[in-house]
Interface confidence: medium
């Protein structure tokens, strides 16, 4: 049979290297030789390229080499397939060389901020050494911050006569390190070069861009003064590398601005001892380039009633995240402060906090929380300068099986009954929320029985036992990840009871 007609002819001019055409050869049953017929020099010249490979995948491509490739030029390319039964020709295809030229990537040699120009970096590069002298080049510049994975792109063109191979990338974050890569193409071409090697550059530093401020209210002391722990951090979206030399804090009673106290610190928290009335606290951060905008927070009076609006709250784990959701009865509340810290018996030292706006849920990556640790999570509604009553729950980012089972005791042994009691597993050993307990018991040489009770129950009465019989009993505490047995206890039922 005649060979299949070559289809899907595609040509690329790897600039000043070769012109390679490829095609779909079809299902060949016998050896087929392909000849690529070309007219070039605007139809004035013609020549052939013949595949000489015996493997079918290499036979579906052929290359023409310098110096018989010029740009600009128009080519016709036709592929002939020949086997023992005859010759078949492809459709004639037409190519403008400048439309299919592909160059090497440019080389970025410098990425630098421009003195005195904020939020900008200048990229300097060398054009690919092999690039058409007669064509303009178009470029795509892609960039991302060092700790991001998603690229942003900007497209621009450069005139071939333009000696200035630079581009000013604007609208960036201050004092942030960026990763830059560049690719180019002949302006008329559909083929882009590969991406250049990546190069890093940093924007200029600015004054700090702002702070987020929070507080932890503690019970009033004997003298009526109340300790308030002030906490702050860089505003969301602030540059990761933003430097701060220190903080100015000032506070005053709501009723009297004349009683303003000021303080300086380089720490990221501060303990204030305030009177019982309401106060305003303000602060700024500063560095060698200036001050941040002011952050302000109202501290309510001790006797002030805070509003309540969260009706229900739950936590669940979904796709490597801990998700906390709540329902609110107040439609006008759209900002919430989330606090979370490990539930340990000692005073919490590592309180974390974050605000949420325009949503009634909060998510945190599982790996930002310790696995098998119980966290106390509180959500505070915020309305203007007022902070509402928090709703708190406990949650685990990742649950495991308890590291030990419940400590178990046997009480009130009777002829046919017994009470099994157990203690809660210490917090540090639970590794998850205990959802139930299972009591396993078995008469010596007899069949085993089990009974499951919910986690609020710490004792259980076994009935219908055999008199004067040895039993073994064990209690298992379970989390969603599985259960762990406590130590097994032996007991023997009585032979008779005083009540018999």
């Amino acid at each position: 049979a005649l060979p299949a007609k070559p289809e899907n002819i595609s040509c690329v001019y790897y600039y000043r290297k070769n012109l390679t055409c490829t095609w779909s050869p079809g299902k060949e049953t016998s050896y087929t030789q392909y000849t690529v017929k070309r007219t070039y020099a605007f139809g004035e010249k013609h020549d052939n390229c013949t595949t000489n490979s015996s493997t079918s995948e290499n036979r579906a491509s052929c290359s023409f080499f310098l110096p018989r490739i010029t740009i600009p030029d128009n080519y016709t390319i036709e592929v002939e397939a020949e086997n023992g039964d005859g010759v078949i020709k492809s459709h004639m295809t037409y190519w403008r060389l400048e439309n299919i030229a592909k160059t090497e990537p440019p080389k970025i040699f410098r990425v630098k901020p421009v003195l005195g120009i904020k939020r900008m970096i200048q990229i300097e590069w060398i054009k690919p050494e092999l690039a058409p002298v007669s064509s303009d080049l178009k470029y795509t510049l892609r960039f991302r911050t060092v700790n991001s994975t998603s690229w942003m792109e900007v497209n621009f063109a450069k005139n071939r006569k333009d000696k200035n191979q630079t581009y000013n990338l604007t609208g960036l974050q201050p004092f942030t390190e960026y990763v830059i890569a560049l690719r180019c193409a002949v302006k008329e071409s559909k083929f882009w070069s590969d991406w250049s090697q990546e190069k890093m550059g940093m924007t200029e530093e600015e004054a700090p861009c702002g702070l987020e401020l929070w507080r932890v209210l503690k019970p009033a002391e004997a003298d009526g003064r109340r300790p308030v722990r002030l906490l702050w951090k860089k505003a969301r979206g602030a540059p990761v590398l933003e430097k701060t030399l220190g903080y100015n804090i000032w506070y005053y009673p709501e009723s009297n601005t004349n009683l303003t106290e000021t303080m300086n610190t380089t720490n990221q928290q501060l303990e204030l001892h305030l009177g019982g009335e309401s106060f305003w606290v303000s602060m700024i951060s500063y560095n060698s380039l200036g001050k941040s905008p002011v952050a302000t927070l109202r501290i309510p009076a001790i006797q002030e009633k805070s509003f309540q609006c969260i009706e229900v709250m739950q936590a669940c784990v979904a796709e490597d995240q801990l998700v906390v959701k709540w329902q609110s009865s107040a439609l006008d509340v759209n900002t919430w402060m989330i606090e979370w810290f490990p539930d340990v018996d000692s005073e919490p030292t590592t309180l974390s906090w974050e605000s949420v706006s325009q949503a009634t849920n909060w998510t945190i990556q599982q790996d930002k929380l310790k696995p098998f640790w119980c966290y106390n999570i509180s959500v505070y509604p915020m309305l203007h300068d007022k902070v509402g009553e928090p709703y708190s729950i406990q949650a685990y980012a990742k649950e495991g099986v308890p590291s030990e089972g419940p400590e178990t005791k046997v009480e009130n042994i009777g002829v046919k009954t017994v009470t099994i009691t157990w203690k809660e597993i210490p917090k540090s050993e639970r590794k998850g929320i205990i959802c139930n307990y299972t009591i396993f018991y078995q008469a010596e040489g007899g069949k085993g029985f089990s009974k499951t009770v919910n986690s609020s129950i710490l004792q259980y009465g076994l009935e219908s036992l055999k008199r004067k019989t040895s039993y073994i009993v064990q209690v298992m505490a379970s989390t969603s990840a599985g259960g762990t047995n406590g130590t097994s206890i032996n007991f023997k039922t009585l032979s008779f009871s005083v009540f018999e």
Epitope: F65, L66, P67, R68, E129, L130
Partner: antibody, heavy 121, light 107 residues
Framework: QVQLVQSGAEVKKPGASVKVSCKAS????????MNWVRQAPGQGLEWMGL????????DYNPQFQGRVTITADKSTSTAYMELSSLRSEDTAVYYC??????????????WGQGTLVTVSS | DIQMTQSPSSLSASVGDRVTITCQAS??????VAWYQQKPGKAPKLLIY???TEAQGVPSRFSGSGSGTDFTLTISSLQPEDFATYYC?????????FGGGTKVEIK
């Protein structure tokens, strides 16, 4: 800037071979064909052949076929022209010349300084 | 092979003269012709390619024209540094061939 630097003058006996080198700099060596042209004393220019350093492909003037071998070493950006079975009429200045513009192949845009080869018994 | 016949083989002219050199190809070579200038003891220098395109850095007094088989190099106003030998060359295909050269001398 583009530069082609050739090896020094040679004196050879008839029947011997000569190998002239041409070191390229200031451009991508594999991106341009390298030609060899000779000029006998007081005579015109005669094209001998070329090499494409990218793939080693050569193209020779049939007048020299079998006697001339053009090679290229990509690692050192150097082209070589070897002429064997020398005779007295091969006495000439031998030039390497880089292929020229995008839209004019076979134009000899940049030339080496030339190497005088004298064939004499 | 394509033969390139150049004329005249030599000419004498004065500074400021308009000089014309012609070259005839043995077959139709469209516009694939280049012109070179060579001074004694030096390598040739490319002036014109594709019959009429000036090479980089070549003074505008040099111009080329023609297509098919007949080609011309014109120096509009001869300068002292233009006294040299000029060669035409076809760049249609291999093998490349040159004209015999035209020596431009001071009158």
């Amino acid at each position: 800037q583009v530069q082609l630097v050739q090896s020094g003058a040679e004196v050879k006996k008839p029947g011997a071979s000569v190998k002239v080198s041409c070191k390229a700099s200031g451009y991508t060596f594999t991106g341009y064909a390298m030609n060899w042209v000779r000029q006998a004393p007081g005579q015109g220019l005669e094209w001998m052949g070329l090499i494409n350093p990218y793939n080693g492909g050569t193209d020779y003037n049939p007048q020299f076929q079998g006697r001339v071998t053009i090679t290229a070493d990509k690692s050192t950006s150097t082209a070589y022209m070897e002429l064997s079975s020398l005779r007295s009429e091969d006495t000439a200045v031998y030039y390497c010349a880089r292929d020229g513009y995008d839209d004019g192949p076979y134009t000899l845009e940049t030339w080496g300084q030339g190497t005088l080869v004298t064939v004499s018994s | 092979d394509i033969q390139m016949t150049q004329s005249p083989s030599s000419l004498s002219a004065s500074v400021g003269d308009r000089v014309t050199i012609t070259c005839q190809a043995s077959e139709d070579i469209y516009s694939f012709v280049a012109w070179y200038q060579q001074k004694p003891g030096k390598a040739p220098k490319l002036l014109i390619y594709n019959a009429q395109t000036e090479a980089q850095g070549v003074p505008s007094r040099f111009s080329g024209s023609g297509s098919g088989t007949d080609f011309t190099l014109t120096i509009s106003s001869l300068q002292p540094e233009d006294f040299a030998t000029y060669y035409c060359q076809h760049h249609y295909d291999s093998p490349l061939t040159f004209g015999g050269g035209t020596k431009v001398e001071i009158k």
